[in-house]
């Protein structure tokens, strides 16, 4: 089976306050089985932004139908962006288990927030 890669094609995304930000993430293999999660930041202080198996996440919508078993696009849209949303976002694949364990991370996408146009 093909080794899983997590592709975050954008090093950075710049969005005006109040707009929506699309953060792209695709995977190249359906294995191992387990959910995708998005985090802002790295390490112990990272913040969960989206978990395929949990919810709801009111400001986050998935770009594709992630409930379909064959889906490999886990891009997300975050609405009503504020300066507090700035940071580096990581798309991370977890291996199913009790508990799920982190398997592989994308390279990250840095979200910067521009002032709202006046």
């Amino acid at each position: 089976e093909e080794e899983l890669q997590i592709i975050q094609p954008d090093k950075s995304v710049s969005v005006a306050a109040g707009e929506s930000a699309i953060l792209h993430c695709t995977i190249t293999s359906l294995f191992p089985v387990g959910p995708i999660q998005w985090f802002r930041g790295a390490g112990p202080a990272r913040v969960l932004i989206y978990n395929q198996r949990q919810g709801p996440f009111p400001r986050v919508t998935t770009v594709s139908e992630t409930t379909k078993r064959e889906n490999m696009d886990f891009s997300i849209s975050i609405s009503n962006i504020t300066p507090a949303d700035a940071g580096t976002y990581y798309c991370i694949k977890f291996r199913k288990g009790s508990p799920d364990t982190e398997f592989k991370s994308g390279a990250g996408t840095e979200l910067s927030v521009r002032a709202k146009p006046s």
């Epitope: 592709i7 094609p9 990250g108 840095e110």
Partner: antibody, heavy 118, light 108 residues
Framework: DVQLVESGGGVVRPGESLRLSCAAS????????MSWVRQGPGEGLEWVAG????????WYADSVKGRFTISRDNSKNTLYLRLFSLRTEDTAIYYC???????????WGLGTLVTVSS | EIVLTQSPGTLSLSPGETATLSCRAS??????LAWYQQKPGQAPRLLIY???SRATGIPDRFSGSGSGTDFTLTISSLQSEDFAVYYC??????????FGGGTKVEIK
């Protein structure tokens, strides 16, 4: 006019270090991801490293991972590349390149020559 | 890593002729492909991005086509200043970004 001016190249021995700089002018430096691309003598182009617009995300080619460090100082409109544990195969012209809205390079500097020789 | 294979390695043509350069990707890169021109002693110059869009200031004798894995750069009615080395580059899949090995267009 967009200008990218590299400096810091020179002749070093294997195992030594070097710091390359790229001074940017004529555009909003902090609005662009940046990369370093190198070209060995008589060879083709090889992407080396890239950095997001605020510096939160860095990417490296496997050939330099763990040996080179890309960074930027947006207050000085300057991009850097630290080269550690240099090898003879690192001998090349190192170009600083501005990334457009996608990861291709719309402006390049003239390059700085790094020669690694015993 | 996506490998880009350019062919031919060298193209010998006369001014006024048409040059057809090929770039083949080892995986689907959609339309995420750029072409650059490099003359001796100079930095590369962006010619084409997104497979077929001309960069600012590039004459319309340069055109790009293709998507997926097969791409073509066509230079119609070659001028003396067009004799150079041409590189393709794929992007959009995150690291590593890769270049083809280049095609040299030389005067016959």
């Amino acid at each position: 006019d967009v200008q990218l001016v590299e400096s810091g190249g020179g002749v070093v021995r294997p195992g030594e270090s070097l710091r390359l700089s790229c001074a940017a002018s004529g555009f909003a430096f902090s609005d662009h991801d940046m990369s370093w691309v190198r070209q060995g003598p008589g060879e083709g182009l090889e992407w080396v490293a890239g950095i997001s617009l605020r510096g939160g995300v860095t990417w490296y080619a496997d050939s330099v991972k763990g040996r080179f460090t890309i960074s930027r100082d947006n207050s000085k409109n300057t991009l850097y590349l630290r080269l550690f544990s240099l090898r003879t195969e690192d001998t090349a012209i190192y170009y600083c390149a501005r990334e457009s809205w996608n990861t291709f390079f719309d402006y390049w500097g003239l390059g700085t020559l790094v020669t690694v020789s015993s | 890593e996506i490998v880009l294979t350019q062919s031919p390695g060298t193209l010998s043509l006369s001014p006024g002729e048409t040059a057809t350069l090929s770039c083949r990707a080892s995986q689907n890169v959609r339309s995420n492909l750029a072409w650059y021109q490099q003359k001796p002693g100079q930095a590369p110059r962006l010619l084409i991005y997104d497979a077929s869009s001309r960069a600012t200031g590039i004459p319309d004798r340069f055109s790009g086509s293709g998507s997926g894995t097969d791409f073509t750069l066509t230079i119609s009615s070659l001028q003396s200043e067009d004799f150079a080395v041409y590189y393709c580059q794929q992007y959009g899949n995150g690291p590593p970004l890769t270049f083809g090995g280049g095609t040299k267009v030389e005067i016959k």
